[in-house]
Interface confidence: medium
């Protein structure tokens, strides 16, 4: 079990924060960064299913974005390897009640931060 700070949820050696507030994509990442985290990077189907299950019905930003005409990239700069479909024509990805979709960066949504768990 992950050792996570208060208000963070552990899953498979990572800690996740599910916001109550809403922000645009950029402000959401700034919040995550200030918490020694990043907008969530989804590394497996199990993780995706956990996030979809835990976040409830609201849309939540995750750490995928793309420049115009460029491939999707995670926050840390690595390219997305098409682990799951992303619907829509926006430049920033979020999780909805069915999976992943995309929207313009200035729209406001809840968000999910992720970071590695604390090894004591």
């Amino acid at each position: 079990q992950a050792a996570c700070p208060e208000s963070w949820i552990g899953f498979q050696r990572k800690c996740f924060y599910f916001s109550d507030d809403t922000k645009n994509w950029t402000s959401s990442q700034r919040f995550c960064d200030s918490q020694d985290a990043d907008l969530a990077q989804v590394e497996s189907f199990q993780e995706l299913n956990f996030l979809l299950r835990y976040k409830g019905p609201s849309d939540h930003w995750i750490g995928l974005s793309r420049e115009q005409g460029q491939p999707w990239k995670w926050i840390n700069g690595t390219e997305w390897t098409r682990q799951f479909p992303i619907l829509g024509a926006g430049e920033c990805a979020y999780l909805n009640d069915k999976g992943a979709s995309s929207a313009r960066h200035y729209t406001e949504r809840k968000w999910i931060c992720s970071k590695s768990d604390i090894h004591v």
């Epitope: 950029t26 990442q29 960064d33 200030s34 918490q35 985290a37 990043d38 974005s65 990239k73 970071k115």
Partner: antibody, heavy 125, light 108 residues
């Protein structure tokens, strides 16, 4: 290994703009696992963090409240460098200015592990 | 802003002995604390980050401890090159990083 090389004038007139540049070798200014900071040091104020820029799919800037209205930190990806601009300087801005690199290892920040050589800036007419 | 207070301002210790430097934060910074060593005319050098992790190339006679608001840097078996000024710095979640005023470690 990562190295930072600073350049810029050592004397700035009051009310003018202080401009310093920090050239990065051994890393990229748009690295997803670093933040690039400016720090200054003076006998009266000690070590003072001024601000930072970093890239996480988009560029972010954060500034200290004491200089927020006067400061700009800008990355230049084509030259792999970042710069500091401090407007409307006064003699209180006289200090040694350092550029620094902060690691972000697996989302967690560490300390300021790489420093430039420092630039002594005097604000005087 | 978080205020960092270091004590003592000056510490006199003999070579070969142990030095203990303290740093206190005005509010919790979790383990987001670093220690630096600075010698005259040089940039500060990172010794410890995350309150207790040694930076690359730092000898194991340097160790850090603490979390929340109270932190300690311990230097065992002091070598002549260890006499310098030491600073603590918080890099907690406010993103407004602040340094302590420094402790000068001098030869007794």
């Amino acid at each position: 290994q990562v190295q930072l090389q600073q350049s810029g004038p050592g004397l700035v007139r009051p009310s003018q703009t202080l401009s310093l540049t920090c050239v990065i070798s051994g890393d990229s200014v748009s690295s997803g696992s670093a933040a690039w900071n400016w720090i200054r040091q003076s006998p009266s104020r000690g070590l003072e963090w001024l601000g930072r820029t970093y890239y996480r799919a988009k560029w972010y800037n954060e500034y200290a409240g004491s200089v927020k209205s006067r400061i700009t930190i800008s990355p230049d990806t084509s030259k792999n460098q970042f710069s500091l601009q401090l407007n409307s300087v006064t003699p209180e801005d006289t200090a040694v200015y350092f550029c620094t690199r902060q690691d972000k290892d697996n989302t967690r920040y560490s300390g300021l592990g790489v420093w430039g050589q420092g630039t002594t800036v005097t604000v005087s007419s | 802003d978080v205020v960092m207070t270091q004590s003592p301002a000056t510490l006199s210790v003999s070579p070969g002995e142990r030095a203990t430097l303290s740093c206190r934060a005005s509010q919790s910074v979790s383990s987001n604390l670093a220690w630096y060593q600075q010698k005259p005319g040089q940039a500060p050098r990172l010794l410890i980050y995350g309150a207790s992790s040694r930076a690359t190339g730092i000898p194991d006679r340097f160790s850090g401890s603490g979390s929340g608001t109270d932190f300690t840097l311990t230097i065992n078996r002091l070598e002549p090159e260890d006499f310098a000024v030491y600073y603590c710095q918080q890099y907690g979640s406010s993103s407004m990083y602040t340094f302590g005023q420094g402790t000068k470690l001098e030869i007794k």
